[in-house]
Amino acid sequence: RKIPKVGHTFFQKPESCPPVPGGSMKLDIGIINENQRVSMSRNIESRSTSPWNYTVTWDPNRYPSEVVQAQCRNLGCINAQGKEDISMNSVPIQQETLVVRRKHQGCSVSFQLEKVLVTVGCTCVTPVIHHVQ
Amino acid sequence: GITIPRNPGCPNSEDKNFPRTVMVNLNIHNRNTNTNPKRSSDYYNRSTSPWNLHRNEDPERYPSVIWEAKCRHLGCINADGNVDYHMNSVPIQQEILVLRREPPHCPNSFRLEKILVSVGCTCVTPIVHHVA
């Protein structure tokens, strides 16, 4: 699937659009809102009933090079006594993001957009019970 | 910018960092992953900190549709199905990269944009502030 062209009739292509070769697009990787910071509740990964750890993946041919992934610490959830309750399940919550991948073919370099699935944290769910006939 | 290993046989003029502007193939790799979280799992209903998924649409952005989570309760759902106010439902937020049409309305010219999305909710023990 390609990135959709703007379909609305009131979105006529302005004269100011830069010329782009067929089959490609111009991408400015100077990030808008680069300096915004996540103001998430403090240490929710440790305070959650479905706690998780973070690991950082690094790839110099990816932009951004650093992607943080979460992993649930337990199969079950943590109860009020601080013990694992295996009648409930800790499950990962995932979100897609875009990255730019650099590919080397000989001495030439090409760039490709890529969707990456990031695990952002975990939540505690009631399990689905499958009854065996 | 990001430093990358250079092929020793290539000319030294190659930039070690990502250039500010790149030409990118219109086809997106891994594009077929499911973008609708309602279809990919029902965790939003089964969680002890359930959430609603609100559709956020912007034709000047790719992807044009992003789903925003809003926790349904202040507390968490207990075994009886009632809200437990000894615990809190809180959103899990994540910074993601999207494409913003720049200049506006241009079909094949974009800039990366970082946006903050609430992906789901999790149940946490509240932080208790003791008053001296």
């Epitope: - | 202040l74 507390g75 009886d80 009632n82 809200v83 106010y85």
Partner: nanobody, 116 residues
Framework: EVQLVESGGGLVQAGGSLRLSCAAS????????VGWYRQPPGLQREWVAI????????YADSSVKGRFTVSVDKVKNTVTLQMNSLKPEDTAVYYC?????????WGQGTQVTVSS
């Protein structure tokens, strides 16, 4: 059985205000929590504003905080939601909510429609 009865919903233009009121059949003073939920079209109910037993007022998010104000009249046994600067995305069925003895109760709901 506890009853909660809402009033004050209606159709309003964007930027306008509405005041929702809720009459409770039981003492709001003894409730663990009282407040308001809303159900946008096609979604489940989600909380908007809740006052917990310690008197702490909680708002669901920054888009509501600053525009909506929840309050309790413990003498009249009513809970109100003052909604200002209404937006089309505030369109929903609004439910009065209370928790007594660990059990959740909701009213029948009142429709709020914000036209652009």
């Amino acid at each position: 059985e506890v009853q909660l009865v809402e009033s004050g919903g209606g159709l309003v233009q964007a930027g306008g205000s509405l005041r929702l009121s809720c009459a409770a059949s039981d003492s709001v003073f003894t409730a663990k929590a009282v407040g308001w939920y809303r159900q946008p079209p096609g979604l489940q109910r989600e909380w908007v504003a809740i006052i917990t037993s310690g008197g702490k007022t909680n708002y669901a998010d920054s888009s509501v905080k600053g525009r909506f104000t929840v309050s309790v009249d413990k003498v009249k046994n009513t809970v109100t939601l003052q909604m200002n600067s209404l937006k089309p995305e505030d369109t929903a069925v609004y439910y009065c909510y209370a928790q007594w003895m660990g059990r959740d109760y909701w009213g029948q709901g009142t429709q709020v429609t914000v036209s652009s």
